[in-house]
C-alpha cells in the first residue's frame, strides 16, 4: 500500500513539476526590467526565451519574437536546449510511469516489468528536473553578470544635464516557476525510484543440497520426506539497475550583452 502511495504521489508531483517546466519555458518573464533606479517608468520591458515584450502604462503590450537563431547569445541557446530536453525527458517519463503505476493493470504485466518502468521513469524525472534547474540557473547567472556589468556603467553622461539611464534586468517570475517546477520533478523522480524498490518482486529459490550419509550413497533433497530440515538457501535476489543517464550539454561562453532584442 505504501509503495502504491509513494509511486502515485511521485507521479503526481512529477506531473505538476513538468507542467511547471513547460509553463516556465513558455513564459515571457524570464528577465524583467529592474525598477529600483527608475520606479517612475511608463514603459516596462521584460524578456523570455522566445520573445521580448514592452508593456506601456497605457496598457498596450508589444511582443517581438527572436526571429534569428544564429544571432542569439550562446547561453540563451543553451538554456533553451536544457529546458526542451527537460520537457522531452519529462514527457517520456510521464508516459512510461503511467504504464508503471501499480494501480493500473495492463494485461499480464509482471511486477518486475513495472519495477523496471518505475525506475526508468524516476531516472527520467530526475534528469528532467536537473535540466530545468540547470537551465534556469544558467539564465539567472547570466542575468546577475549582466546586471552588475550594466550597473558599472549605469549612467553615461551626454553632456550638461542630459543623462541616459541604461535598462537593467532582474529575475523574472519564470525563473522562480522553473526552479520550483524543476525541484518538484526531481522530488517526484526520487519518489518513483524509492517506489521501485518496493515493487521489485521477492524471489525465493530453494537450491538443492546433497547430503552424503556415511556408508551410504543416498542423496536426500530438501523438502522431501526424509530431510525436512531447512538447509535450503533463501536468497532475496534483488535486481541491480544501471541508472547511468547523462546529459552532455556543452557549457558555452557568456554573451557580451543580455539585451538580445
Amino acid at each position: 500500500m505504501a509503495v502504491t502511495a509513494c509511486q502515485g504521489l511521485g507521479f503526481v508531483v512529477s506531473l505538476i513539476g513538468i507542467a511547471g517546466i513547460i509553463a516556465a519555458t513558455c513564459m515571457d518573464q524570464w528577465s524583467t526590467q529592474d525598477l529600483y533606479n527608475n520606479p517612475v517608468t511608463a514603459v516596462f520591458n521584460y524578456q523570455g526565451l522566445w520573445r521580448s515584450c514592452v508593456r506601456e502604462s497605457s496598457g498596450f503590450t508589444e511582443c517581438r519574437g527572436y526571429f534569428t537563431l544564429l544571432g542569439l547569445p550562446a547561453m540563451l541557446q543553451a538554456v533553451r536546449a536544457l529546458m526542451i530536453v527537460g520537457i522531452v525527458l519529462g514527457a517520456i517519463g510521464l508516459l512510461v510511469s503511467i504504464f508503471a503505476l501499480k494501480c493500473i493493470r495492463i494485461g499480464s504485466m509482471e511486477d518486475s516489468a513495472k519495477a523496471n518502468m518505475t525506475l526508468t521513469s524516476g531516472i527520467m524525472f530526475i534528469v528532467s528536473g536537473l535540466c530545468a534547474i540547470a537551465g534556469v540557473s544558467v539564465f539567472a547567472n547570466m542575468l546577475v553578470t549582466n546586471f552588475w556589468m550594466s550597473t558599472a556603467n549605469m549612467y553615461t553622461g551626454m553632456g550638461g544635464m542630459v543623462q541616459t539611464v541604461q535598462t537593467r534586468y532582474t529575475f523574472g517570475a519564470a525563473l522562480f516557476v522553473g526552479w520550483v517546477a524543476g525541484g518538484l520533478t526531481l522530488i517526484g523522480g526520487v519518489m518513483m525510484c524509492i517506489a521501485c524498490r518496493g515493487l521489485a518482486p521477492e524471489e525465493t529459490n530453494y537450491k538443492a543440497v546433497s547430503y552424503h550419509a556415511s556408508g551410504h550413497s543416498v542423496a536426500y533433497k530438501p523438502g522431501g520426506f526424509k530431510a525436512s530440515t531447512g538447509f535450503g538457501s533463501n536468497t532475496k535476489n534483488k535486481k541491480i539497475y544501471d541508472g547511468g543517464a547523462r546529459t552532455e550539454d556543452e557549457v558555452q561562453s557568456y554573451p557580451s550583452k543580455h539585451d538580445y532584442v
Epitope: T41, N45, V162
Partner: antibody
C-alpha cells in the same frame, strides 16, 4: 464615433471642492486609461494623473497629489476628477484624454473651464 | 521629472514654406526594449483641445496629413511641416511619454504671414 464629453464650466469660491466629469462613448471604456491635463490661461499643458478604469488604479503627478482625486463609474463609462481646497491657481481649463499607443493621448474632451474667485 | 525644452517659442512663416521646430529632453526617451522613442507631438488650434499628430517620435497618427513628419532619437527631436498651410496655424507641443510624470514642452507657436 469616439467621444469624450466633459461637464460644463464651473465657478467656485476659494476653499471649495469641484467634481469634473468626462463621459465616454464609442469604445470600450475599461480598455483604455484616462488621463487628466491642466492648461492654465492658454499656457502650456500639465499632466495631472491617470486612472485605469478596469482596476481603478491611479497614478498622480506629485504636484497634484492631495489636490486631485481620480475616480470612474464603469456602469456609465464616466471618469471623474475631484479638485479640493481650491485657490485662484486652480483656475484653468481641464481636459480628459484617452491613452493610446506610445502612452500618447489620442482623444481629448472639449475641456472644462474652472474659475476660482471670491 | 524630465524637462522638455522647445524652440523656437514662436515662428512666422508664409504658406508653402518648410518649417522645423525642435524639442529637447533632459533625459533619453529611447526605450532599449523596443528601440522606440517615447515622444509625442500635439497640435492645438485656438479654442480647441490638443490633437495628436505623432507618437513614438515618428509614427504619424491616422488622418494626419503627410506633410507632418517627426524625427530624432534619444534627447533631440524635430517636427517638420514640409509645406505649411493656413490651417496649420496653431501651437505645437511635444510630450515625454517615457516616464512619470508625463511632461510637456512650453510649445512653439506657428503664425502665418
Amino acid at each position: 464615433e469616439f467621444q469624450l464629453q466633459q461637464s460644463g464650466p464651473e465657478l467656485e469660491k476659494p476653499g471649495a471642492s469641484v467634481r469634473i466629469s468626462c463621459k465616454t462613448s464609442g469604445y470600450s471604456f475599461t480598455g483604455y486609461n484616462m488621463n487628466w491635463v491642466k492648461q492654465s490661461n492658454g499656457e502650456s499643458l500639465e499632466w495631472i494623473g491617470n486612472i485605469d478604469p478596469y482596476y481603478g488604479a491611479t497614478r498622480y503627478n506629485q504636484k497634484f497629489k492631495g489636490k486631485a482625486t481620480l475616480t470612474v463609474d464603469k456602469s456609465s463609462s464616466t471618469a471623474y476628477m475631484q479638485l479640493k481646497s481650491l485657490t485662484s491657481e486652480d483656475s484653468a481649463v481641464y481636459y480628459c484624454a484617452r491613452s493610446y499607443y506610445g502612452n500618447a493621448f489620442d482623444y481629448w474632451g472639449q475641456g472644462t473651464t474652472l474659475t476660482v474667485s471670491s | 521629472d524630465i524637462v522638455m525644452t522647445q524652440s523656437p517659442s514662436s515662428l512666422t512663416v508664409t504658406a508653402g514654406e518648410k518649417v522645423t521646430m525642435s524639442c529637447k529632453s533632459s533625459q533619453s526617451l529611447l526605450n532599449s526594449g523596443n528601440q522606440k522613442n517615447y515622444l509625442t507631438w500635439y497640435q492645438q488650434k485656438p479654442g480647441q483641445p490638443p490633437k495628436l499628430l505623432i507618437y513614438w517620435a515618428s509614427t504619424r497618427e491616422s488622418g494626419v496629413p503627410d506633410r507632418f513628419t517627426g524625427s530624432g532619437s534619444g534627447t533631440d527631436f524635430t517636427l517638420t511641416i514640409s509645406s505649411v498651410q493656413a490651417e496649420d496655424l496653431a501651437v505645437y507641443y511635444c510630450q515625454n511619454d517615457y516616464s512619470f510624470p508625463f511632461t510637456f514642452g512650453s510649445g512653439t507657436k506657428l503664425e502665418i504671414k
